[in-house]
Amino acid sequence: VPPGEDSKDVAAPHRQPLTSSERIDKQIRYILDGISALRKETCNKSNMCESSKEALAENNLNLPKMAEKDGCFQSGFNEETCLVKIITGLLEFEVYLEYLQNRFESSEEQARAVQMSTKVLIQFLQKKAKNLDAITTPDPTTNASLLTKLQAQNQWLQDMTTHLILRSFKEFLQSSLRALRQM
């Protein structure tokens, strides 16, 4: 995880020694670099990246996705709603990142780094959001049964699931990064 530096962030109207905006920005870019490396292995290993049968696998997944109502797009932007969505989405992605562990041969360490860096990012963002409404955490029991279900899929579906998780996580982080730059 790349080291961060503190900055002079102030949550209006009170000055707070919050996490730095630079640290959040760098952390997201670091995770995106990791995802690129994992996608490279996935695409080299199978033809999933060109597959048109994604809908079959997507039926089993409920991957977090940015929608207009989440307030993270330029149109209808709402910083507080958006920040809550980013944190909630990252928390929901954690089970899928756990699934990615052991799905890679040459990039096993990279998969672990993406998972651990995401945990750190969530901590940074929770500090930034500490004046906002409580953020709901996914139910561990539900996550455990989802993980079991995903791991029980056939090889083709597991490959497709891996591809879809990486693609969705990349899109989610890119949208998050754009929105967070305004905050």
Epitope: K8, D9, S21, E22, F77, E79, E80, K128, R178, R181
Partner: antibody, heavy 119, light 106 residues
């Protein structure tokens, strides 16, 4: 036309206060963070402060922290810089600038308003 | 705070010349921007996020670099390009600017 218009500058004595306004027009104000940047006569540019689009987060340079306050009135598409305990070294043209969506770039700037702190 | 040093501080050039301005940071920066300012006017964004051309800016302007060393290049100087150019960085707050480079007519 997309534009920012600053007002409120003028001559003020050291220790005095002034409130600058920055009125936005030609674009939807709500998704953009705003910054103030100043330029002392014949000198370079110095960033002063930033406010997030809804006003939840503000950032200040060390030189103005505790003296200046950045606020918004989104219903009026206007940003304000309340400047207290003014010093001679605060004398400058003050520009407000919009932050480009998805970037930290300051892409639209006002024409500036001159603040002179002198006795 | 991160210090930005531009070089040269001023230069004389002719229309059609290729002009290069450099910006050196005291430590590695996350994002670099370039601005043009004419006397009595507000700065105008030319390049954002290292190398992206801002909307409405002619393609003769280009930006490059990473880490601590960055360059603004004007491939063929035009009469309207005589101005002062500033680099600006963001790596957390505060934003900081270079001291400026004045491009004058030879």
């Amino acid at each position: 036309e997309v534009q920012l218009v600053e007002s409120g500058g003028g001559l003020v004595q050291p220790g005095g206060s002034l409130r600058l306004s920055c009125a936005a027009s030609g674009f939807t104000f709500s998704p953009f963070a705003m910054s103030w940047v100043r330029q002392a006569p014949g000198k370079g540019l110095e960033w002063v402060a930033k406010i997030s689009p809804g006003g939840s987060w503000t950032y200040y340079s060390d030189t103005v922290t505790g003296r200046f306050t950045f606020s918004l009135d989104t219903s009026k598409s206007t940003a304000y810089l309340q400047m207290n305990s003014l010093r001679a070294e605060d004398t400058a043209v003050y520009y407000c600038a919009r932050q480009l969506w998805g970037s930290y770039a300051l892409d639209i700037w006002g024409q500036g308003t001159l603040v002179t702190v002198s006795s | 705070d991160i210090q930005l040093t531009q070089s040269p501080s001023s230069l004389s050039a002719s229309v059609g010349d290729r002009v290069t301005i450099t910006c050196s940071a005291s430590i590695s920066v996350s994002y670099m921007y370039w601005y043009q300012q004419k006397p009595g006017k507000a700065p105008k964004l030319l390049i954002y996020d290292m190398s992206n051309l801002a909307s409405g800016v002619p393609s003769r302007f280009s930006g490059s670099g990473s880490g601590t060393d960055f360059t603004l290049t004007i491939s063929s100087l035009q009469p309207e390009d005589f101005a002062t150019y500033y680099c600006m960085q963001w790596s957390g707050y505060p934003y900081t600017f270079g001291q400026g480079t004045k491009v004058e007519i030879k």
